[in-house]
Protein backbone atom coordinates (compact mmCIF):
# COMPACT_ATOMS: atom_id res chain seq x y z
CA UNK A 1 0.00 0.00 0.00
CA UNK A 2 1.15 3.55 -0.71
CA UNK A 3 2.34 5.70 2.17
CA UNK A 4 -0.42 7.85 3.57
CA UNK A 5 -0.49 11.49 2.49
CA UNK A 6 -2.71 14.17 4.03
CA UNK A 7 -3.80 16.57 1.33
CA UNK A 8 -5.07 20.07 2.05
CA UNK A 9 -5.58 21.38 -1.48
CA UNK A 10 -6.09 25.06 -0.64
CA UNK A 11 -3.16 27.05 0.71
CA UNK A 12 -5.57 29.78 1.79
CA UNK A 13 -9.28 30.42 2.11
CA UNK A 14 -10.90 33.83 2.59
CA UNK A 15 -14.32 34.13 4.20
CA UNK A 16 -16.53 37.06 5.18
CA UNK A 17 -17.30 37.37 8.87
CA UNK A 18 -20.62 35.69 9.66
CA UNK A 19 -20.31 33.23 6.78
CA UNK A 20 -19.20 29.60 6.90
CA UNK A 21 -15.81 28.24 5.90
CA UNK A 22 -15.05 24.87 4.35
CA UNK A 23 -11.56 23.51 4.97
CA UNK A 24 -10.78 20.59 2.69
CA UNK A 25 -8.71 17.57 3.65
CA UNK A 26 -8.38 14.14 2.11
CA UNK A 27 -6.10 11.24 2.92
CA UNK A 28 -4.66 8.94 0.29
CA UNK A 29 -4.87 5.72 2.26
CA UNK A 30 -7.17 3.88 4.66
CA UNK A 31 -4.05 2.82 6.52
CA UNK A 32 -3.37 3.33 9.34
CA UNK A 33 -6.76 3.19 11.01
CA UNK A 34 -7.24 6.11 13.35
CA UNK A 35 -8.94 9.45 13.68
CA UNK A 36 -8.40 12.79 12.02
CA UNK A 37 -7.97 15.88 14.15
CA UNK A 38 -8.03 19.49 13.01
CA UNK A 39 -5.84 22.06 14.75
CA UNK A 40 -5.37 25.79 14.41
CA UNK A 41 -1.69 26.59 14.55
CA UNK A 42 1.23 24.22 14.90
CA UNK A 43 3.50 23.15 17.71
CA UNK A 44 2.74 22.52 21.37
CA UNK A 45 0.32 25.44 21.68
CA UNK A 46 -1.90 24.38 18.81
CA UNK A 47 -5.65 24.61 19.39
CA UNK A 48 -7.90 21.60 18.78
CA UNK A 49 -10.69 22.59 16.40
CA UNK A 50 -12.25 19.21 15.62
CA UNK A 51 -11.66 15.63 16.73
CA UNK A 52 -13.33 12.93 14.69
CA UNK A 53 -13.29 10.48 17.56
CA UNK A 54 -14.33 12.54 20.57
CA UNK A 55 -15.40 15.92 21.91
CA UNK A 56 -18.13 18.45 21.26
CA UNK A 57 -17.51 21.05 18.56
CA UNK A 58 -20.79 22.93 18.06
CA UNK A 59 -19.60 25.14 15.18
CA UNK A 60 -17.72 22.41 13.32
CA UNK A 61 -19.21 19.62 11.24
CA UNK A 62 -17.60 17.08 8.94
CA UNK A 63 -18.46 17.68 5.30
CA UNK A 64 -18.70 14.03 4.35
CA UNK A 65 -20.31 11.39 6.53
CA UNK A 66 -17.47 10.18 8.70
CA UNK A 67 -19.23 6.80 8.98
CA UNK A 68 -19.26 6.35 5.21
CA UNK A 69 -17.46 3.20 4.22
CA UNK A 70 -13.79 3.70 3.31
CA UNK A 71 -14.14 7.42 3.98
CA UNK A 72 -11.01 9.37 3.05
CA UNK A 73 -12.55 12.85 3.05
CA UNK A 74 -12.11 14.66 6.34
CA UNK A 75 -13.05 18.16 5.25
CA UNK A 76 -14.79 20.31 7.83
CA UNK A 77 -17.30 23.11 7.81
CA UNK A 78 -16.99 25.94 10.38
CA UNK A 79 -20.09 28.07 10.81
CA UNK A 80 -20.50 31.72 11.82
CA UNK A 81 -16.91 32.74 11.20
CA UNK A 82 -15.52 35.66 13.22
CA UNK A 83 -12.15 37.44 12.91
CA UNK A 84 -10.98 35.41 15.92
CA UNK A 85 -11.15 32.28 13.71
CA UNK A 86 -8.36 33.50 11.43
CA UNK A 87 -5.24 31.37 11.36
CA UNK A 88 -3.65 28.34 9.74
CA UNK A 89 -5.60 25.11 10.08
CA UNK A 90 -3.93 21.70 9.94
CA UNK A 91 -5.61 18.39 9.19
CA UNK A 92 -3.70 15.72 11.13
CA UNK A 93 -3.99 11.94 10.80
CA UNK A 94 -3.54 9.82 13.93
CA UNK A 95 -2.98 6.10 14.35
CA UNK A 96 -5.40 4.38 16.68
CA UNK A 97 -3.81 3.66 20.02
CA UNK A 98 -3.82 4.47 23.71
CA UNK A 99 -3.25 7.31 23.24
CA UNK A 100 -3.66 7.86 19.51
CA UNK A 101 -0.33 8.61 17.81
CA UNK A 102 0.16 11.41 15.28
CA UNK A 103 1.12 10.03 11.88
CA UNK A 104 1.08 12.91 9.42
CA UNK A 105 -0.12 16.48 9.06
CA UNK A 106 -1.40 18.29 6.04
CA UNK A 107 0.45 21.38 4.80
CA UNK A 108 -2.13 23.70 6.37
CA UNK A 109 -4.78 26.05 5.05
CA UNK A 110 -4.67 29.69 6.06
CA UNK A 111 -8.12 31.02 6.88
CA UNK A 112 -8.39 34.77 6.53
CA UNK A 113 -11.55 36.49 7.62
CA UNK A 114 -12.85 39.50 5.76
CA UNK A 115 -14.41 41.72 8.40
CA UNK A 116 -16.04 45.07 7.71
CA UNK A 117 -14.71 48.14 9.46
CA UNK A 118 -17.00 49.69 12.03
CA UNK A 119 -18.70 52.98 11.15
CA UNK A 120 -16.04 55.69 11.38
CA UNK A 121 -16.40 57.90 14.44
CA UNK A 122 -15.12 61.45 14.03
CA UNK A 123 -14.31 63.49 17.09
CA UNK A 124 -13.27 67.12 17.18
CA UNK A 125 -11.30 69.28 19.59
CA UNK A 126 -12.31 69.48 23.24
CA UNK A 127 -12.36 73.30 23.17
CA UNK A 128 -13.50 75.70 20.50
CA UNK A 129 -11.01 77.69 18.45
CA UNK A 130 -11.35 80.88 16.46
CA UNK A 131 -10.84 81.57 12.78
CA UNK A 132 -7.38 81.09 11.31
CA UNK A 133 -6.52 78.62 14.03
CA UNK A 134 -5.83 74.98 13.17
CA UNK A 135 -7.90 72.32 14.89
CA UNK A 136 -7.51 68.54 14.84
CA UNK A 137 -10.21 66.01 14.04
CA UNK A 138 -9.75 62.32 14.74
CA UNK A 139 -11.42 59.47 12.87
CA UNK A 140 -11.46 55.91 14.22
CA UNK A 141 -12.71 52.64 12.77
CA UNK A 142 -12.17 49.16 14.17
CA UNK A 143 -12.49 45.44 13.60
CA UNK A 144 -11.61 45.16 9.92
CA UNK A 145 -9.62 42.54 8.08
CA UNK A 146 -7.58 42.29 5.92
CA UNK A 147 -5.28 45.15 6.94
CA UNK A 148 -5.37 47.09 3.66
CA UNK A 149 -7.68 50.09 4.01
CA UNK A 150 -8.00 53.56 2.52
CA UNK A 151 -9.00 56.64 4.50
CA UNK A 152 -9.73 60.08 3.07
CA UNK A 153 -10.74 63.38 4.65
CA UNK A 154 -13.03 66.00 3.13
CA UNK A 155 -14.13 69.45 4.19
CA UNK A 156 -17.33 70.50 2.49
CA UNK A 157 -16.63 68.00 -0.29
CA UNK A 158 -13.05 69.13 -0.85
CA UNK A 159 -10.40 66.54 -0.12
CA UNK A 160 -7.95 67.42 2.63
CA UNK A 161 -4.26 66.58 2.51
CA UNK A 162 -3.03 67.51 5.98
CA UNK A 163 -3.65 64.31 7.94
CA UNK A 164 -1.79 61.42 9.50
CA UNK A 165 -3.09 57.85 9.56
CA UNK A 166 -2.09 54.77 11.52
CA UNK A 167 -3.30 51.19 11.18
CA UNK A 168 -2.78 49.00 14.24
CA UNK A 169 -1.35 46.59 15.01
CA UNK A 170 1.62 46.71 12.67
CA UNK A 171 2.07 42.92 12.70
CA UNK A 172 -0.31 40.07 11.93
CA UNK A 173 -3.62 40.19 13.73
CA UNK A 174 -7.14 38.79 13.47
CA UNK A 175 -8.48 42.32 12.98
CA UNK A 176 -7.20 45.86 12.71
CA UNK A 177 -8.03 49.42 13.72
CA UNK A 178 -7.38 52.68 11.92
CA UNK A 179 -6.92 56.10 13.48
CA UNK A 180 -6.41 59.25 11.48
CA UNK A 181 -5.93 62.83 12.61
CA UNK A 182 -6.67 65.68 10.20
CA UNK A 183 -5.65 69.31 10.72
CA UNK A 184 -8.22 71.86 9.59
CA UNK A 185 -7.71 75.63 9.40
CA UNK A 186 -10.87 77.41 10.51
CA UNK A 187 -12.41 80.42 8.82
CA UNK A 188 -15.21 82.69 10.04
CA UNK A 189 -17.46 81.06 7.45
CA UNK A 190 -17.08 77.54 8.88
CA UNK A 191 -20.10 77.46 11.19
CA UNK A 192 -21.99 75.40 8.61
CA UNK A 193 -18.95 73.45 7.45
CA UNK A 194 -18.55 69.72 7.86
CA UNK A 195 -15.59 67.39 7.88
CA UNK A 196 -16.04 63.88 6.54
CA UNK A 197 -13.86 60.85 7.14
CA UNK A 198 -14.31 58.24 4.41
CA UNK A 199 -13.11 54.65 4.80
CA UNK A 200 -12.84 52.24 1.85
CA UNK A 201 -12.22 48.52 2.36
CA UNK A 202 -12.46 45.35 0.27
CA UNK A 203 -15.46 44.19 2.33
CA UNK A 204 -17.48 47.28 1.45
CA UNK A 205 -17.77 46.51 -2.26
CA UNK A 206 -16.93 50.03 -3.35
CA UNK A 207 -19.43 51.68 -1.03
CA UNK A 208 -17.27 53.48 1.53
CA UNK A 209 -18.31 54.21 5.10
CA UNK A 210 -18.42 57.82 6.26
CA UNK A 211 -18.20 59.56 9.57
CA UNK A 212 -18.91 63.26 9.94
CA UNK A 213 -18.31 66.09 12.35
CA UNK A 214 -19.73 69.59 12.23
CA UNK A 215 -17.27 72.43 12.55
CA UNK A 216 -19.97 74.26 14.50
CA UNK A 217 -18.86 72.12 17.45
CA UNK A 218 -15.27 73.27 17.05
CA UNK A 219 -15.45 76.92 16.08
CA UNK A 220 -16.00 80.13 17.94
CA UNK A 221 -16.63 83.29 15.95
CA UNK A 222 -16.10 86.31 18.23
CA UNK A 223 -18.56 89.19 17.86
CA UNK A 224 -17.99 92.62 16.36
CA UNK A 225 -19.22 95.40 18.65
CA UNK A 226 -20.48 98.81 17.62
CA UNK A 227 -22.03 101.36 19.94
CA UNK A 228 -23.99 104.26 18.39
CA UNK A 229 -26.31 106.96 19.58
CA UNK A 230 -29.68 107.17 17.90
CA UNK A 231 -31.73 110.36 17.45
CA UNK A 232 -32.84 112.06 20.63
CA UNK A 233 -36.06 110.68 21.90
CA UNK A 234 -38.30 112.66 24.20
CA UNK A 235 -36.92 115.39 26.36
CA UNK A 236 -33.52 114.63 27.89
CA UNK A 237 -33.39 110.99 26.70
CA UNK A 238 -30.60 109.56 24.57
CA UNK A 239 -31.00 106.13 22.94
CA UNK A 240 -27.68 104.30 22.71
CA UNK A 241 -27.50 100.95 20.89
CA UNK A 242 -24.87 98.23 21.09
CA UNK A 243 -24.80 96.10 17.96
CA UNK A 244 -23.17 92.69 18.50
CA UNK A 245 -22.72 91.01 15.13
CA UNK A 246 -21.44 87.88 13.45
CA UNK A 247 -20.86 85.73 16.54
CA UNK A 248 -21.10 81.98 17.18
CA UNK A 249 -22.14 80.17 19.29
CA UNK A 250 -25.17 81.97 20.66
CA UNK A 251 -24.01 81.85 24.29
CA UNK A 252 -23.52 85.54 25.02
CA UNK A 253 -24.07 87.93 27.93
CA UNK A 254 -24.25 91.68 27.45
CA UNK A 255 -23.84 94.20 30.29
CA UNK A 256 -24.39 97.95 30.13
CA UNK A 257 -22.23 100.06 32.43
CA UNK A 258 -22.93 103.73 33.19
CA UNK A 259 -19.77 105.40 34.41
CA UNK A 260 -18.48 101.96 35.40
CA UNK A 261 -21.60 100.93 37.27
CA UNK A 262 -23.71 98.02 36.04
CA UNK A 263 -26.93 99.29 34.60
CA UNK A 264 -28.38 96.17 33.00
CA UNK A 265 -27.35 92.61 32.09
CA UNK A 266 -28.98 90.57 29.34
CA UNK A 267 -28.53 87.03 27.99
CA UNK A 268 -28.93 86.26 24.30
CA UNK A 269 -31.59 83.68 23.50
CA UNK A 270 -33.61 82.44 20.54
CA UNK A 271 -31.79 84.67 18.08
CA UNK A 272 -32.40 84.32 14.35
CA UNK A 273 -29.52 82.71 12.50
CA UNK A 274 -27.62 84.49 9.74
CA UNK A 275 -27.07 82.72 6.45
CA UNK A 276 -23.54 81.81 7.50
CA UNK A 277 -24.76 80.37 10.81
CA UNK A 278 -23.64 83.31 12.97
CA UNK A 279 -25.90 85.50 15.08
CA UNK A 280 -26.53 89.23 15.52
CA UNK A 281 -27.94 90.97 18.54
CA UNK A 282 -28.80 94.59 19.25
CA UNK A 283 -29.28 96.03 22.71
CA UNK A 284 -30.17 99.61 23.56
CA UNK A 285 -30.03 101.82 26.57
CA UNK A 286 -32.05 104.97 27.23
CA UNK A 287 -29.97 107.52 29.08
CA UNK A 288 -31.73 110.33 30.97
CA UNK A 289 -29.33 113.19 30.35
CA UNK A 290 -31.03 115.55 32.81
CA UNK A 291 -30.14 113.18 35.61
CA UNK A 292 -26.42 113.80 34.98
CA UNK A 293 -24.36 116.90 35.53
CA UNK A 294 -21.27 115.51 33.79
CA UNK A 295 -20.74 113.53 30.62
CA UNK A 296 -21.86 109.90 30.85
CA UNK A 297 -19.48 107.10 29.86
CA UNK A 298 -21.52 104.14 28.58
CA UNK A 299 -19.84 100.81 28.15
CA UNK A 300 -21.29 97.84 26.30
CA UNK A 301 -19.55 94.78 27.79
CA UNK A 302 -19.94 91.48 26.01
CA UNK A 303 -18.91 88.13 27.40
CA UNK A 304 -19.08 85.57 24.58
CA UNK A 305 -18.95 81.81 25.14
CA UNK A 306 -17.09 82.10 28.43
CA UNK A 307 -14.27 84.17 26.93
CA UNK A 308 -12.85 87.34 28.54
CA UNK A 309 -15.22 90.30 28.19
CA UNK A 310 -14.99 92.65 25.24
CA UNK A 311 -15.85 96.29 25.89
CA UNK A 312 -16.95 99.13 23.64
CA UNK A 313 -17.46 102.54 25.27
CA UNK A 314 -19.32 105.64 24.23
CA UNK A 315 -19.48 109.05 25.89
CA UNK A 316 -22.70 111.02 26.01
CA UNK A 317 -21.85 114.72 26.30
CA UNK A 318 -24.34 116.22 28.73
CA UNK A 319 -23.26 119.79 27.81
CA UNK A 320 -24.11 119.16 24.17
CA UNK A 321 -27.75 118.47 24.86
CA UNK A 322 -29.92 121.59 24.97
CA UNK A 323 -33.25 120.43 26.20
CA UNK A 324 -35.10 121.40 23.04
CA UNK A 325 -33.07 119.52 20.40
CA UNK A 326 -31.51 116.17 19.67
CA UNK A 327 -28.61 115.46 17.42
CA UNK A 328 -26.81 112.31 16.41
CA UNK A 329 -23.53 114.14 16.31
CA UNK A 330 -23.83 115.74 19.69
CA UNK A 331 -22.43 112.66 21.31
CA UNK A 332 -18.86 111.67 20.68
CA UNK A 333 -17.99 108.02 20.16
CA UNK A 334 -14.79 107.61 22.09
CA UNK A 335 -15.09 103.85 22.24
CA UNK A 336 -12.50 101.33 21.22
CA UNK A 337 -12.64 97.59 21.10
CA UNK A 338 -11.07 96.94 24.45
CA UNK A 339 -10.61 93.20 23.81
CA UNK A 340 -8.06 91.52 25.88
CA UNK A 341 -8.40 88.26 23.91
CA UNK A 342 -5.10 86.52 23.70
CA UNK A 343 -5.97 85.31 20.16
CA UNK A 344 -3.94 87.07 17.49
CA UNK A 345 -6.74 86.70 15.01
CA UNK A 346 -9.00 89.04 16.98
CA UNK A 347 -6.95 92.11 16.21
CA UNK A 348 -8.28 92.39 12.67
CA UNK A 349 -11.80 92.86 13.97
CA UNK A 350 -10.89 96.40 15.04
CA UNK A 351 -11.01 97.55 11.45
CA UNK A 352 -14.56 96.49 10.67
CA UNK A 353 -16.40 99.55 11.92
Amino acid sequence: EEELQVIQPEKSVSVAAGDSATLNCTVTSLIPVGPIQWFRGAGPGRELIYHQKEGHFPRVTSVSESTKRNNMDFSIHISNITPADAGTYYCVKFRKGSPDVEVKSGAGTELSVRAKPSAPVVSGPAVRATAEHTVSFTCESHGFSPRDITLKWFKNGNELSDFQTNVDPAGKSVSYSIRSTARVVLTRRDVHSQVICEVAHVTLQGDPLRGTANLSEAIRVPPFLEVTQQSMRADNQVNVTCQVTKFYPQRLQLTWLENGNVSRTEMASALPENKDGTYNWTSWLLVNVSAHRDDVKLTCQVEHDGQPAVNKSFSVKVSAHPKEQGSNTAAENTGTNERDYKDDDDKHHHHHH
Partner: antibody
Framework: QVQLVQSGAEVKKPGASVKVSCKAS????????INWVRQAPGQGLEWIAM????????HYNQIFKDRATLTTDTSTSTAYMELRSLRSDDTAVYYC????????????WGRGTLVTVSS | DIVLTQSPDSLAVSLGERATINCRAS??????????IFWYQQKPGQPPKLLIY???NLDSGVPDRFSGSGSGTDFTLTISSLQAEDVAVYYC????????FGQGTKLEIK
Protein backbone atom coordinates in the same frame (compact mmCIF):
# COMPACT_ATOMS: atom_id res chain seq x y z
CA GLN B 1 -10.59 5.31 26.07
CA VAL B 2 -13.30 3.57 24.10
CA GLN B 3 -15.64 1.47 26.24
CA LEU B 4 -18.74 -0.52 25.33
CA VAL B 5 -20.75 -1.61 28.36
CA GLN B 6 -23.47 -4.18 27.72
CA SER B 7 -26.59 -5.04 29.70
CA GLY B 8 -26.75 -8.13 31.93
CA ALA B 9 -27.58 -11.73 31.13
CA GLU B 10 -31.15 -12.62 30.15
CA VAL B 11 -33.18 -15.81 30.33
CA LYS B 12 -36.10 -15.96 27.90
CA LYS B 13 -38.74 -18.44 26.88
CA PRO B 14 -39.09 -19.56 23.25
CA GLY B 15 -41.20 -17.12 21.24
CA ALA B 16 -40.31 -14.17 23.48
CA SER B 17 -38.19 -11.13 22.58
CA VAL B 18 -34.99 -9.82 24.09
CA LYS B 19 -33.49 -6.32 23.91
CA VAL B 20 -29.78 -6.03 24.64
CA SER B 21 -28.20 -2.62 25.24
CA CYS B 22 -24.68 -1.35 24.61
CA LYS B 23 -23.63 1.98 26.17
CA ALA B 24 -20.68 3.64 24.45
CA SER B 25 -18.21 6.05 25.99
CA UNK B 26 -14.79 7.54 25.23
CA UNK B 27 -15.65 8.60 21.70
CA UNK B 28 -18.23 10.48 19.64
CA UNK B 29 -21.02 7.93 19.37
CA UNK B 30 -22.49 9.24 16.11
CA UNK B 31 -19.17 9.02 14.23
CA UNK B 32 -18.77 5.23 14.15
CA UNK B 33 -20.79 2.17 13.20
CA ILE B 34 -21.92 -0.32 15.83
CA ASN B 35 -21.92 -4.01 14.89
CA TRP B 36 -23.72 -6.86 16.63
CA VAL B 37 -22.16 -10.31 16.61
CA ARG B 38 -23.23 -13.47 18.41
CA GLN B 39 -21.47 -16.62 19.50
CA ALA B 40 -23.35 -19.76 20.43
CA PRO B 41 -21.73 -21.93 23.13
CA GLY B 42 -18.59 -23.60 21.71
CA GLN B 43 -19.28 -22.15 18.27
CA GLY B 44 -17.78 -19.48 16.04
CA LEU B 45 -18.67 -15.82 15.50
CA GLU B 46 -21.79 -14.89 13.55
CA TRP B 47 -22.38 -11.31 12.34
CA ILE B 48 -25.96 -10.11 12.92
CA ALA B 49 -26.16 -6.51 11.73
CA MET B 50 -24.68 -3.01 11.93
CA UNK B 51 -26.06 0.49 12.52
CA UNK B 52 -24.81 4.01 11.87
CA UNK B 53 -25.89 6.04 14.92
CA UNK B 54 -25.68 9.34 13.01
CA UNK B 55 -28.64 8.51 10.76
CA UNK B 56 -29.79 5.02 11.87
CA UNK B 57 -28.77 3.45 8.56
CA UNK B 58 -28.68 -0.33 9.08
CA HIS B 59 -27.37 -3.40 7.31
CA TYR B 60 -28.61 -6.86 8.32
CA ASN B 61 -27.40 -10.37 7.77
CA GLN B 62 -30.21 -11.91 5.70
CA ILE B 63 -30.59 -14.66 8.31
CA PHE B 64 -31.67 -12.10 10.93
CA LYS B 65 -33.43 -9.54 8.74
CA ASP B 66 -36.95 -10.44 9.84
CA ARG B 67 -36.24 -11.00 13.54
CA ALA B 68 -33.60 -8.46 14.56
CA THR B 69 -34.01 -4.69 14.95
CA LEU B 70 -31.15 -2.31 15.71
CA THR B 71 -31.77 1.12 17.23
CA THR B 72 -29.74 3.81 18.96
CA ASP B 73 -30.38 6.57 21.45
CA THR B 74 -27.83 9.30 20.69
CA SER B 75 -28.76 11.27 23.82
CA THR B 76 -27.38 8.44 25.97
CA SER B 77 -24.89 7.02 23.42
CA THR B 78 -26.60 3.66 23.65
CA ALA B 79 -27.18 1.06 20.95
CA TYR B 80 -29.87 -1.62 21.18
CA MET B 81 -30.41 -4.97 19.51
CA GLU B 82 -33.82 -6.58 19.77
CA LEU B 83 -34.32 -10.19 18.69
CA ARG B 84 -37.84 -11.51 18.39
CA SER B 85 -39.41 -14.99 18.16
CA LEU B 86 -36.62 -16.50 20.16
CA ARG B 87 -35.71 -20.15 19.69
CA SER B 88 -33.45 -22.37 21.74
CA ASP B 89 -30.70 -22.08 19.11
CA ASP B 90 -30.62 -18.32 19.76
CA THR B 91 -28.91 -19.09 23.04
CA ALA B 92 -25.60 -17.27 22.67
CA VAL B 93 -23.38 -14.49 23.90
CA TYR B 94 -24.33 -11.30 22.02
CA TYR B 95 -21.57 -8.77 21.45
CA CYS B 96 -21.64 -5.16 20.32
CA UNK B 97 -18.51 -3.91 18.58
CA UNK B 98 -17.46 -0.51 17.28
CA UNK B 99 -16.02 -0.04 13.79
CA UNK B 100 -13.28 2.57 14.21
CA UNK B 101 -12.01 2.70 10.64
CA UNK B 102 -15.32 2.66 8.74
CA UNK B 103 -14.01 -0.52 7.18
CA UNK B 104 -16.89 -2.69 8.42
CA UNK B 105 -14.52 -4.25 10.91
CA UNK B 106 -14.77 -4.57 14.69
CA UNK B 107 -12.09 -2.62 16.52
CA UNK B 108 -13.53 -2.44 20.02
CA TRP B 109 -15.84 -4.99 21.61
CA GLY B 110 -18.24 -5.09 24.53
CA ARG B 111 -17.85 -7.93 27.04
CA GLY B 112 -20.96 -9.66 25.74
CA THR B 113 -24.46 -10.45 27.04
CA LEU B 114 -25.48 -14.05 27.54
CA VAL B 115 -29.03 -14.69 26.35
CA THR B 116 -30.42 -18.09 27.31
CA VAL B 117 -33.56 -19.29 25.58
CA SER B 118 -35.15 -22.14 27.49
CA SER B 119 -38.61 -23.39 28.22
CA ASP C 1 -22.44 -14.04 0.24
CA ILE C 2 -18.69 -14.47 0.41
CA VAL C 3 -17.81 -17.55 2.42
CA LEU C 4 -14.55 -17.67 4.35
CA THR C 5 -12.94 -21.06 5.04
CA GLN C 6 -10.14 -21.29 7.56
CA SER C 7 -7.57 -24.03 7.72
CA PRO C 8 -6.74 -25.90 9.73
CA ASP C 9 -9.61 -26.09 12.19
CA SER C 10 -7.08 -26.61 14.96
CA LEU C 11 -3.34 -26.36 15.22
CA ALA C 12 -0.74 -27.37 17.82
CA VAL C 13 2.63 -25.63 17.70
CA SER C 14 5.62 -25.73 20.03
CA LEU C 15 6.53 -22.61 21.99
CA GLY C 16 8.92 -20.45 20.00
CA GLU C 17 7.86 -22.07 16.72
CA ARG C 18 6.03 -20.48 13.80
CA ALA C 19 2.26 -20.86 13.56
CA THR C 20 0.42 -20.31 10.28
CA ILE C 21 -3.35 -20.07 9.79
CA ASN C 22 -4.97 -19.75 6.36
CA CYS C 23 -8.20 -18.12 5.25
CA ARG C 24 -9.67 -18.63 1.80
CA ALA C 25 -12.51 -16.51 0.40
CA SER C 26 -15.09 -17.88 -2.04
CA UNK C 27 -14.40 -14.81 -4.19
CA UNK C 28 -11.98 -11.92 -4.17
CA UNK C 29 -12.16 -9.60 -1.20
CA UNK C 30 -9.90 -7.02 -2.84
CA UNK C 31 -11.12 -3.60 -3.96
CA UNK C 32 -9.39 -0.34 -4.89
CA UNK C 33 -6.02 -1.76 -3.92
CA UNK C 34 -7.14 -2.91 -0.47
CA UNK C 35 -7.68 -6.44 0.79
CA UNK C 36 -10.69 -6.40 3.10
CA ILE C 37 -9.58 -9.14 5.47
CA PHE C 38 -9.32 -8.81 9.26
CA TRP C 39 -7.93 -11.24 11.84
CA TYR C 40 -9.18 -11.59 15.43
CA GLN C 41 -7.91 -13.45 18.48
CA GLN C 42 -10.37 -14.76 21.07
CA LYS C 43 -9.28 -16.19 24.39
CA PRO C 44 -11.69 -18.22 26.53
CA GLY C 45 -14.32 -16.11 28.32
CA GLN C 46 -13.27 -12.93 26.50
CA PRO C 47 -14.58 -11.01 23.51
CA PRO C 48 -12.55 -11.17 20.29
CA LYS C 49 -9.67 -8.74 19.81
CA LEU C 50 -8.65 -7.21 16.47
CA LEU C 51 -5.10 -8.19 15.45
CA ILE C 52 -4.72 -7.37 11.76
CA TYR C 53 -6.71 -5.06 9.50
CA UNK C 54 -6.78 -4.82 5.72
CA UNK C 55 -4.88 -8.13 5.47
CA UNK C 56 -1.45 -6.97 6.60
CA ASN C 57 -1.67 -4.03 9.04
CA LEU C 58 -0.99 -4.64 12.69
CA ASP C 59 -3.55 -3.08 15.01
CA SER C 60 -2.37 -0.83 17.80
CA GLY C 61 -0.76 -2.66 20.70
CA VAL C 62 -0.43 -5.98 18.89
CA PRO C 63 3.01 -7.61 19.22
CA ASP C 64 5.00 -7.64 16.01
CA ARG C 65 5.39 -11.46 16.07
CA PHE C 66 1.94 -11.37 14.45
CA SER C 67 1.76 -10.61 10.75
CA GLY C 68 -0.74 -10.93 7.93
CA SER C 69 -0.32 -11.46 4.23
CA GLY C 70 -2.17 -12.41 1.07
CA SER C 71 -4.39 -10.88 -1.56
CA GLY C 72 -7.43 -11.64 -3.64
CA THR C 73 -8.82 -14.84 -2.09
CA ASP C 74 -5.97 -16.35 -0.06
CA PHE C 75 -4.76 -14.90 3.21
CA THR C 76 -2.44 -16.01 6.01
CA LEU C 77 -1.99 -15.09 9.66
CA THR C 78 1.50 -15.90 10.93
CA ILE C 79 2.84 -15.96 14.47
CA SER C 80 6.61 -15.98 14.05
CA SER C 81 7.47 -17.31 17.51
CA LEU C 82 4.60 -18.77 19.48
CA GLN C 83 4.18 -17.59 23.07
CA ALA C 84 2.04 -19.24 25.75
CA GLU C 85 -0.36 -16.27 25.78
CA ASP C 86 -1.08 -16.80 22.07
CA VAL C 87 -3.23 -19.85 22.83
CA ALA C 88 -6.66 -18.83 21.50
CA VAL C 89 -9.14 -19.23 18.68
CA TYR C 90 -8.33 -17.11 15.62
CA TYR C 91 -10.97 -15.83 13.19
CA CYS C 92 -10.72 -14.14 9.84
CA UNK C 93 -13.46 -11.75 8.70
CA UNK C 94 -14.01 -10.00 5.40
CA UNK C 95 -15.82 -6.75 4.66
CA UNK C 96 -15.73 -6.72 0.88
CA UNK C 97 -19.51 -7.02 1.17
CA UNK C 98 -21.47 -7.31 4.39
CA UNK C 99 -19.22 -8.97 6.97
CA UNK C 100 -18.87 -12.70 7.51
CA PHE C 101 -16.45 -14.67 9.67
CA GLY C 102 -14.45 -17.80 9.04
CA GLN C 103 -15.32 -20.76 11.26
CA GLY C 104 -12.24 -20.21 13.46
CA THR C 105 -8.94 -22.01 14.07
CA LYS C 106 -8.03 -23.25 17.52
CA LEU C 107 -4.34 -22.77 18.31
CA GLU C 108 -2.78 -24.84 21.06
CA ILE C 109 0.71 -25.48 22.37
CA LYS C 110 2.32 -28.78 21.38
Amino acid sequence: QVQLVQSGAEVKKPGASVKVSCKASGYTFTNYWINWVRQAPGQGLEWIAMIDPSDSETHYNQIFKDRATLTTDTSTSTAYMELRSLRSDDTAVYYCAMDYGSLYAMDYWGRGTLVTVSS
Amino acid sequence: DIVLTQSPDSLAVSLGERATINCRASKSVSSSGYNYIFWYQQKPGQPPKLLIYLASNLDSGVPDRFSGSGSGTDFTLTISSLQAEDVAVYYCQHSRELPTFGQGTKLEIK
